[in-house]
């Protein structure tokens, strides 16, 4: 068998809402993956599991099942959404994200994704992780790759 390549492209959109009384931020983050099947037979994308971390704390998880199949030597682009919650124990983030004096409220999130593919009863898992900027102060649609956090070092939170 040849490889199945998974490429995390980036954040496609981030939609924000707030619970003012609980000082909580809700971010629905839609991400884009490219999955390439380099084989001469079809493969099934059985599931995608994703999680988002902020300051080493998991703030959101998602799982998609029975997603699609990819034909021989074909590529599919898949969008998946992770609902995240930055809650009261990080209330300084609510203060930051709702502070209008700051024009761009970029926070650094670590996106982790694992894709499980199957072919002829064989299962394979491929994982990726990437730091991304997301604006927690407004709804944002990104051009693919625009939100990438380029610092290779662990960012300070």
């Amino acid at each position: 068998p040849r490889s199945i390549d998974v490429k995390y492209i980036g954040v496609k959109s981030a939609y924000v809402s707030y619970d003012v009384q609980k000082r909580t931020i809700y971010l629905n983050i839609t991400n884009t993956l490219n999955i390439t099947n380099n084989n001469y037979y079809s493969v099934e994308v059985e599931n995608i599991t994703a999680q988002v971390q902020f300051a080493k704390t998991v703030i959101g998880k998602a799982r998609l099942n029975n997603i699609t199949h990819i034909g021989p030597l074909d590529m599919k682009q898949i969008d998946y959404t992770v609902p995240t919650v930055i809650a009261e124990e990080m209330s300084y983030m609510y203060d930051f994200c709702t502070l209008i004096s700051i024009k761009v409220h970029n926070i650094v999130l670590m996106m982790q994704v694992t894709v499980t593919t199957t072919y002829f009863g064989h299962s394979e898992q491929i994982s990726q992780e990437r730091y991304q900027y997301v604006d927690c102060g407004r709804n944002t649609t990104y051009q693919l790759g625009q939100s990438e956090y380029l610092n290779v070092l662990q960012p300070q939170q």
Epitope: V16, Y18, Y92, Y94, D95, F96, T98, L99, I100, S101
Partner: antibody
Framework: EVQLVESGGGLVKPGGSLKLSCAAS????????MSWVRETPEKRLEWVAF????????YYADNVKDRFTISRDNAKNNLYLQMRHLKSEDTAMYYC??????????WGQGTLVTVSV | DIVMTQAAFSNPVTLGTSASISCRSS???????????LFWYLQKPGQSPQLLIY???NLASGVPDRFSSSGSGTDFTLRISRVEAEDVGVYYC?????????FGGGTKLEIK
């Protein structure tokens, strides 16, 4: 316990300079924006200057622009207000306040600046 | 600049009864994110101001629930349900929607 302690106020002649300091403790200073607010002798409150958590955004009230400079040292948990070309109308009690989307959540006790001949 | 307007004095109130303090802004303080950027502060005699209400209607930490606030985008009311002696002072409304942040002139709570 969150504490903000201002210092550096005093009596200064018109045209003179002063540097106010605000020592912060009891919270992660580098996570928060800060502002200076003053209370005039007529008991009016006026916002003076703002600085974001990392210092990337700085704003001033029109009547102090080009005369006052706000800065911060996150390593020392200190906020500063350098005041130059002081005028009699700058006479006030100056407060530092922790700023954010939820308002000025904490205030210092204030330091009095008197500009007079 | 956004102008915040308050009456200088409240109607004198008897301890244990309710009081209302009004504030008006020259522009709507409702942001597109759904939050209204109106805040209430109390400055007690000889003290620094303290936050009472954030984002129009939310009680700040440690503030008794005798205090409440409501309003539209431009007209706001702070209510004290059972006035106590310790509530005496000057109440300021503030907008944090736009720079410069602007304060109302303050309303002094008068006790009969």
């Amino acid at each position: 316990e969150v504490q903000l302690v201002e210092s550096g106020g005093g009596l200064v002649k018109p045209g003179g300079s002063l540097k106010l300091s605000c020592a912060a403790s009891g919270f992660t200073f580098s996570n928060y924006a800060m502002s200076w607010v003053r209370e005039t002798p007529e008991k009016r409150l006026e916002w003076v200057a703002f600085i974001s958590d990392g210092g990337g955004y700085i704003y001033y009230a029109d009547n102090v622009k080009d005369r006052f400079t706000i800065s911060r040292d996150n390593a020392k948990n200190n906020l500063y207000l350098q005041m130059r070309h002081l005028k009699s109308e700058d006479t006030a009690m100056y407060y530092c306040a922790r700023d954010g989307g939820t308002g000025f959540t904490y205030w210092g006790q204030g330091t009095l600046v008197t500009v007079s001949v | 600049d956004i102008v915040m307007t308050q009456a200088a004095f409240s109607n004198p109130v008897t301890l244990g009864t309710s009081a209302s303090i009004s504030c008006r802004s020259s522009k709507s303080l409702l942001h597109s994110n759904g939050i209204t950027y109106l805040f209430w502060y109390l400055q007690k005699p000889g003290q620094s101001p303290q936050l009472l209400i954030y984002q129009m209607s939310n009680l700040a930490s440690g503030v008794p629930d005798r205090f409440s606030s409501s309003g539209s985008g431009t007209d706001f009311t702070l209510r004290i349900s059972r006035v106590e002696a310790e509530d005496v002072g000057v109440y300021y409304c503030v907008q944090n929607l736009e720079l410069p942040y602007t304060f109302g002139g303050g309303t002094k709570l008068e006790i009969k």
